[in-house]
């Protein structure tokens, strides 16, 4: 009686169960009544991740450097190539296929969570009592100085984009 | 959009000398550059190029006597112990692909 | 490193015909190959890239093909002014690691 289904990494074909090849292996010839599963290893640049009985192994995925990428985990003949965005740059997907440059805080707002490789910047208005002169992508609202703790006063009130002034204290003749 | 070489002169053996690539209508932030050289009655030949973030690649033939560096503007190829067989003409590149060439900078190595 | 070689060194051709120029590759490049047309005193021109894609500006008359190990540039319809020697450029890498750009030895083409 020919079998209708196939233990685990078996599979059916001419009313026969063959042995699947292992990931990192392409199948070259189906298994027959005599002869076992033939299969051969991926050649270099490409992989099959799994038990398989695919005849052409998958070309490793290119991290173009036109697009801002760069390799972030070799591939091998089971695993693909793995990308990821240059310094200073983040993917544009999940499939991180392109590369954006990271976002900076503008005057006035400051960073409040530094960008990965995956996501962008994120930036938050500085509160009362901070501010942020520059446009970074690292730098986070500073606190205003205290003139009290120097032992002077405030000639210039701080804003968000701004620190306050310090001066000295009128002296009573 | 273009880009435009300079630096090129005549130099005796062993002197350093400095290409910069100069990028018009396009910032060199968001590409590749590459540097490229072609010595007289030769054929074109790869120097290396340097990525968005500022990682160069080199030739295997380069072995650490050139370096490329770059700015928001510029790109420069460093060169040391230059001789006779470094005389070319040399050329910057925007992208791995060479969509846009300057007209080149010769250099001249001779005693 | 990976080797590109060109064939032939030179192809002669009459106005209206057809060229053909061959790059082969020592391991697979995929498609990352580009095609340049060079003039004396010029800075090369890229024609086609990522061994099909057609640059701006480049009539249609150039056609790129080929992947893997094995490339071709076709000229039709042959100007005069596609007198040149053309080049061949994998502008890829070789593996994750190593990136190179090697050219081919060039090919003259002489417009009878």
């Known amino acids: 009686e020919p079998p209708t289904a196939c233990r685990e990494k078996q599979y059916l074909i001419n009313s026969q169960c063959c042995s699947l090849c292992q990931p990192g292996q392409k199948l070259v010839s189906d298994c027959t009544e005599f002869t076992e599963t033939e299969c051969l290893p991926c050649g270099e640049s490409e992989f099959l991740d799994t038990w398989n009985r695919e005849t052409h192994c998958h070309q490793h995925k290119y991290c173009d450097p036109n697009l801002g990428l760069r390799v972030q985990q070799k591939g091998t003949s089971e695993t693909d190539t793995i990308c990821t965005c240059e310094e200073g740059w983040h993917c544009t997907s999940e499939a991180c296929e392109s590369c954006v440059l990271h976002r900076s805080c503008s005057p006035g707002f400051g960073v409040k969570q530094i960008a990965t490789g995956v996501s962008d910047t994120i930036c938050e208005p500085c509160p009362v009592g901070f501010f942020s002169n520059v446009s970074s992508a690292f730098e986070k609202c500073h606190p205003w100085t205290s003139c009290e703790t120097k032992d002077l006063v405030v000639q210039q009130a701080g804003t968000n984009k701004t620190d306050v002034v310090c001066g000295p204290q009128d002296r009573l003749r | 959009q273009s880009v435009e070489e300079s630096g090129g002169r005549l130099v005796t053996p062993g002197t350093p000398l400095t290409l910069t690539c100069t990028a018009s209508?396009?910032?060199?932030?968001?590409?590749?550059m590459g540097w490229f050289r072609q010595a007289p009655g030769k054929g074109l030949e790869y120097i290396g190029w340097?990525?968005?973030?500022?990682d160069p690649y080199y030739a295997s033939w380069v072995k650490g006597r050139f370096t490329i560096s770059k700015t928001s503007t510029t790109v420069d190829l460093k060169m040391t112990s230059l001789t006779t067989e470094d005389t070319a003409t040399y050329f910057c590149?925007?992208?791995?692909?060479?969509?846009?060439w300057g007209p080149g900078t010769l250099v001249t190595v001779s005693s | 490193d990976i080797v590109m070689t060109q064939t032939p060194a030179s192809v002669e051709a009459a106005v209206g015909g057809t060229v053909t120029i061959k790059c082969q590759a020592s391991?697979?490049?995929?498609?990352?190959l580009a095609w340049y047309q060079l003039k004396p005193g010029q800075p090369p021109k890229l024609l086609i890239y990522s061994a099909s894609t057609l640059a701006s500006g480049v009539p249609s008359r150039f056609k790129g093909s080929g992947s893997g190990t094995e490339f071709t540039l076709t000229i039709s319809d042959l100007e005069c002014a596609d007198a040149a020697t053309y080049y061949c450029?994998?502008?890829?890498?070789?593996?994750?690691?190593?990136?190179?750009?090697?050219f081919g030895g060039g090919t003259e083409v002489v417009v009878k």
């Open positions: 391991q697979s490049i995929s498609s990352r």
């Open positions: 209508g396009f910032s060199l932030i968001g590409y590749v």
């Open positions: 340097i990525s968005f973030g500022g």
């Open positions: 590149a925007r992208s791995t692909y060479g969509d846009i």
């Open positions: 450029q994998n502008h890829g890498y070789a593996t994750s690691e190593s990136y190179t750009n090697t």
